[in-house]
């Protein structure tokens, strides 16, 4: 852009150098050149000479008018055609920007990833503003009434060291730019309720050589949280549909989950956990791929009637991936598999 330009006159913009996208805009150029009575005054946008909607107001001043200006940024400058000069003479230049006032931030969420030492807050910013927009995160203790504020662009990490005076907070986000300001809804946060357990990892899997082969998946976490509730989803790599199983886990030892799977198939497994009774889930673990061994004897494999898990398992559901390119975004099927039979029922969204 044009940041430091030595002007021989002035350039100004109505309604201002930053304005709402789609507005009508007038840009004025006033020359103050020595030894020049300009024949013409010219406007350039992003280096290209403009031809239309230019009005010469008087000997020194001209105006260009734009109907419904909708470019996020433009670099304007104007020049004079001075008699006896081969080249046009620069008068002045300006950066102009158009955009939108911010939407109110929505879906404000704050979590503490175990061992991170931070409270991480995220929100939806809404539609693009096209101009510099800052977010002010307000964190107010409900016990001491003290308020802290943090500047951010899209999310914020707040050290838990600065949240030691209290456990209960009110959090909200203020979106600010040159065209307006909006506040999110307030979020009530209790620090003990927003901890997400340390990452769960599937370490290995093995398929036994039994008459009815079973696959044992080993998984672990370094969490210190005692009561943890987990979900493991799995599917063949050729399938779009996930099966989901739920577990109460105790990570003082490595977890083992048993599955009866199709032989000679490549399966992908993922796991995620949350503190029992809390809202926030870990992201799904990295996909773990395991190839089941070949069938030894002839056996009619029936997914609906096979025993699913040795460990306590509340429900087994099925989930369909919306697209093979987005394996993390899942859509629940209306059927929930329970006690080996399809049944209707609701289940928490996955993904």
């Amino acid at each position: 852009g044009i940041t430091s330009i030595n002007c021989s006159g002035d350039m100004w913009v109505e309604p201002g150098e930053i304005f709402q996208m789609g507005m009508n805009v007038s840009i004025y150029c006033q020359e103050a050149l020595k030894h020049c009575r300009p024949r013409n005054l010219y406007f350039y946008k992003n280096g290209f000479k403009e031809e239309f909607d230019i009005t010469r107001i008087n000997r020194t001043t001209a105006r260009i008018w734009y109907k419904g200006f909708s470019e996020p940024h433009a670099y304007m400058h104007c020049t004079a055609e001075c008699p006896g000069h081969f080249q046009e003479t620069l008068i002045c230049g300006k950066d102009i920007s158009s955009g939108h006032p911010p939407d109110a931030p929505s879906n404000l969420t704050c979590v503490i990833y175990e061992y991170s030492g931070n409270m991480t807050c995220t929100w939806n910013t809404g539609k693009p503003t096209y101009i510099d927009t800052k977010y002010i995160v307000h964190v107010k203790s409900l016990e001491t009434e003290e308020e802290q504020q943090y500047l951010a662009s899209s999310y914020v990490k707040i050290s838990t060291d600065s949240l030691q005076g209290s456990r209960k907070y009110l959090v909200w986000v203020q979106a600010v730019n040159s065209l307006g300001m909006e506040n999110s809804q307030q979020l009530h946060v209790h620090l003990d309720d927003i901890v997400i357990p340390s990452a769960s990892i599937i370490s290995r899997a093995e398929t036994t050589n039994d008459t009815v082969p079973k696959t044992i998946v080993y998984w672990k976490s370094k969490t210190m949280i005692e009561k943890v509730f987990c979900e493991m989803r799995y599917k063949t790599t050729t399938n779009q549909t996930w099966s989901v199983k739920e577990f109460d886990a105790n990570f003082t030892y490595v977890q083992q989950s048993e599955f009866y799977l199709e032989p000679d198939s490549k399966y992908v497994f993922q796991v995620r956990c949350q503190e029992t009774g809390k809202r926030n889930w870990q992201p799904w673990s990295s996909p773990f791929v395991h190839q089941t061994s070949q069938e030894t004897g002839k056996r009619n494999w029936q997914p609906w009637s096979s025993p699913f898990v040795h460990q306590t398992s509340q429900t087994v559901s099925q989930v369909t991936a919306k697209s093979s390119h987005e394996p993390q975004k899942m859509e629940m099927l209306s059927a929930t598999i329970f006690r080996g039979h399809p049944a209707s029922g609701n289940h928490q969204d996955i993904g």
């Epitope: 308020e147 802290q148 504020q149 943090y150 500047l151 951010a152 600065s162």
Partner: nanobody, 116 residues
Framework: QVQLQESGGGLVQPGGSLRLSCAAS????????MRWVRQAPGKGLEWVSG???????IYADSVKGRFTISKDNAKNTLYLQLNSLKTEDTAMYYC??????????GSQGTQVTVSS
């Protein structure tokens, strides 16, 4: 109780520079976001700039690229460096708690006059 004391104002020519200070006491300065606001003669209060406890900054369009806000937690002091001053920067300058807003809590302020 919260006390804020501004200083550093003065008379300066257009294009000149000044550094304003705000001495703070009565609260945990290092954990507190701060701002500068100003009031030109015969006009309302105008928010100028803000800084959070980690040093992230925000500026009004009218001062962006010319003014710089900073804070020294060891000295409990907020600063505003004013460069390339214009006549329209003439105002009483006040510091306040909080990163954004066109209000202040009744401190004395410091006068900046830009004139040739």
């Amino acid at each position: 109780q919260v006390q804020l004391q501004e200083s550093g104002g003065g008379l300066v020519q257009p294009g000149g520079s000044l550094r304003l200070s705000c001495a703070a006491s009565g609260f945990t300065f290092r954990l507190t976001a701060m701002r500068w606001v100003r009031q030109a003669p015969g006009k309302g209060l105008e928010w100028v700039s803000g800084i959070d406890s980690r040093g992230s900054t925000i500026y009004a369009d009218s001062v962006k690229g010319r003014f710089t806000i900073s804070k020294d937690n060891a000295k409990n002091t907020l600063y505003l460096q004013l460069n390339s001053l214009k006549t329209e920067d003439t105002a009483m300058y006040y510091c306040a708690q909080g990163v954004y807003g066109d209000t202040y809590s009744g401190s004395q302020g410091t006068q900046v006059t830009v004139s040739s």
